[in-house]
């Protein structure tokens, strides 16, 4: 019978040893067995479980000429970069005939300088604003005690005496560095150094100071900026189209904003070149040498209406007996608001000017009472919004109607607000 088939007689002549070291270590475990006949495949166990994907090698050396003679089998298991999950009890296992043989165990342990699971990260904070930093380290060996340092100065008298995993900082007024030392029986590991950049606080109380149709004057209260003076503030304005959907806290506008920079102080800015009678959203951020604050929430504002910037266009005025027909087109120039209607001024030579409110119509027929012999009659038209009248057109002379000249269908002006007029 092949050697090693008796339960009491193990084929193993060399058992795995022990490895203890730091994370990342590359190590090798070996076992050796002597068997008669066909050499078996050597399997490796960790804590009793077969390692299916073990990085293991196997060498077989015959001790005689015949295949049925004894063989020496050496198996090696590689641990390429030791991690906590690699630690445990290791054994070799072989199946010989109907029996299973397991080597004596070897042990793999992890012991070294502390290993950081979490380190403080770079971040920006507003001046005088509380924040937390995190640091976490483990052994083995345990315990691992932490010591926080601010600008290379320890924040406690000894490791383990101050804050541990989380450091609460009530606020900073200057950019500072933080690191964390992890101490265990093997020594000290120092974390990365995190730079905490102190930015200005978000400005407050953004509000309108004054409004004009194409101009808004706004002001705000600056936030604290630590030891770093504010260099400038930046104001953004964006059209509040109905479909745009700027929310109070939305970080970025959906379209390119109008951006203006303000030297500070004063914390005030006149925003020009705006559209009249238009809703905008505005926000402000202030900058120091360390960087910009966060933006304020979007503030909805609106430019007021203005008067139309030009007169109505293409005015024509014709007279046929006791009737006069006047028509015109909407001004080409910006209305600067909602058009409410037109005013018409009618004047003859040596007669007072008469004003009429035509409403939104763009034509009117005047019933001229009397003999209609008033000479040099002229008509002027102006558009108006809630803000007032726009400029009057140049006087247009009332021409006699010639047969064949087109005359649109029209209504006589009979309404109480626009009665027929006569000149003495």
């Amino acid at each position: 019978a092949p050697r090693g088939t008796q339960a009491e007689e193990s084929p193993f002549v060399g058992n795995p040893g022990n490895i203890t070291g730091a994370r990342g270590l590359t190590g090798t475990l070996r076992c050796q067995l002597q068997v008669q006949g066909e050499p078996p495949e050597v399997h490796w166990l960790r804590d009793g479980q077969i390692l299916e994907l073990a990085d293991s090698t196997q060498t077989q050396v015959p001790l005689g000429e015949d295949e049925q003679d004894d063989w020496i089998v050496v198996s090696q298991l590689r641990i390429t970069s030791l991690q906590l999950s690699d630690t445990g009890q290791y054994q070799c296992l072989v199946f010989l005939g109907h029996q299973t043989f397991v080597s004596q165990p070897g042990y793999v342990g992890l012991e070294g300088l502390p290993y950081f699971l979490e380190e403080p990260e770079d971040r920006t904070v507003a001046a005088n604003t509380p924040f937390n930093l995190s640091c976490q380290a483990q052994g083995p060996p345990e315990p691992v005690d932490l010591l926080w340092l601010q600008d290379a100065v320890p924040l406690a008298t000894a490791p383990g005496h101050g804050p541990q995993r989380s450091l609460h900082v009530p606020g900073l007024n200057k950019t500072s560095s933080f690191s964390c030392e992890a101490h265990n029986a093997k020594g000290v590991t120092t974390s990365r150094t995190a730079t905490i950049t102190v930015l200005p606080q978000q400005p407050r109380n953004l509000h309108l100071v004054s409004r004009q149709p194409t101009e808004l004057e706004v002001a705000w209260t600056p936030g604290l900026s630590g030891i770093y003076p504010l260099t400038h503030c930046t104001l953004q304005a964006v059209l509040s189209d109905d479909g745009m959907g700027i929310q109070a806290g939305e970080p970025d506008p959906p379209e390119e904003p109008l951006t203006s920079q303000a030297s500070v102080p004063p914390h005030q800015l006149r925003l020009g070149s705006l559209h009249p009678h238009t809703p905008y959203h505005i926000r402000v951020a202030c900058t120091s040498s360390q960087g910009p604050s966060s933006w304020t929430h979007w503030l909805p504002v609106e430019t007021p209406e203005g008067v139309p910037l030009g007169p109505p266009e293409n005015i024509s005025a014709t007279r046929n007996g006791s009737q006069a027909f006047v028509h015109w087109q909407e001004p080409r120039a910006p209305l600067q608001g909602t058009l409410l209607g037109y005013r018409l001024a009618y004047q003859g030579q040596d007669t007072p000017e008469v004003l009429m409110d035509i409403g939104l119509r763009q034509e009117v027929t005047l019933e001229l009472q009397g003999d209609g012999s008033v000479s040099n009659l002229t008509v002027c038209v102006a558009a108006y919004t809630a803000a007032g009248d726009g400029p009057w057109s140049l006087p247009v002379p009332l021409e006699a109607w010639r047969p064949g000249q087109a005359q649109p269908v029209h209504q006589l002006v009979k309404e109480p607000s626009t009665p027929a007029f006569s000149w003495p």
């Epitope: 040893g17 590359t26 970069s81």
Partner: antibody, heavy 125, light 107 residues
Framework: EVQLVESGGGLVQPGGSLRLSCAAS????????IHWVRQAPGKGLEWVGW????????YYADSVKGRFTISADTSKNTAYLQMNSLRAEDTAVYYC??????????????????WGQGTLVHHHH | DIQMTQSPSSLSASVGDRVTITCRAS??????VAWYQQKPGKAPKLLIY???FLYSGVPSRFSGSGSGTDFTLTISSLQPEDFATYYC?????????FGQGTKVEIK
């Protein structure tokens, strides 16, 4: 007698490919890890990678990862280094070496006890 | 990766001299250090493994010592065939890394 013999080196264009062979005799390739190490002209030694020929597992230096592939054919007792996307800085003598494994039940680290004679890989200028 | 810094980068010595080459690791590598000898146009040869163990067939005038971060290769009495370049190598972590080499020349 343990011996390693490399072959396959030569002149190559930048971006080109080459396959080096490492024929082993006097020992079984499946019993140890085989390493590839290179040496640029007039420079020191740089590890390229290793293979476990028994399992086919390979491990690479960052400088060659994704471009070089190490393989082995245990029936031919030969290891291979397939080099693709070659660069000027890959110009070197390439050695294969056997890992020494004579340290009892466990060891930390490793050494390379048998080396091939080396094969030169160089670029057109 | 762990850096291995060898010193000196070269030295001149006479036959019979005691020669010491040092190697410093950038972090603790326990005793996972090997030393190799390389002659021009030839492959490296293993001299010392595991910091202090003499490899089979290597003359006993070669010895190694050290652990942690500082390692030494000593040639107790330099012989004509010892003029070569010597490299240290750590294998505590993967990738293994080599020192830049120390060239031992005839004075």
């Amino acid at each position: 007698e343990v011996q390693l013999v490399e072959s396959g080196g030569g002149l190559v264009q930048p971006g080109g490919s080459l396959r080096l062979s490492c024929a082993a005799s006097g020992f079984s390739l499946s019993g140890s890890w085989i390493h590839w190490v290179r040496q640029a002209p007039g420079k020191g030694l740089e590890w390229v990678g290793w293979i476990n020929p028994y399992r086919g597992y390979a491990y690479y230096a960052d400088s060659v990862k994704g471009r070089f592939t190490i393989s082995a054919d245990t029936s031919k007792n030969t290891a291979y280094l397939q080099m693709n996307s070659l660069r000027a800085e890959d110009t070197a003598v390439y050695y294969c070496a056997r890992e020494y494994s004579g340290w009892g039940g466990s060891s930390v680290g490793y050494a390379m006890d048998y080396w091939g004679q080396g094969t030169l890989v160089h670029h057109h200028h | 990766d762990i850096q291995m810094t060898q010193s000196p980068s070269s030295l001149s010595a006479s036959v019979g001299d005691r020669v010491t080459i040092t190697c410093r690791a950038s972090q603790d590598v326990s005793t996972a250090v090997a030393w190799y000898q390389q002659k021009p146009g030839k492959a490296p040869k293993l001299l010392i493994y595991s910091a202090s163990f003499l490899y089979s067939g290597v003359p006993s005038r070669f010895s190694g010592s050290g652990s942690g971060t500082d390692f030494t290769l000593t040639i107790s009495s330099l012989q004509p065939e010892d003029f070569a370049t010597y490299y240290c190598q750590q294998s505590y972590t993967t990738p293994p890394t080599f020192g830049q080499g120390t060239k031992v020349e005839i004075k």
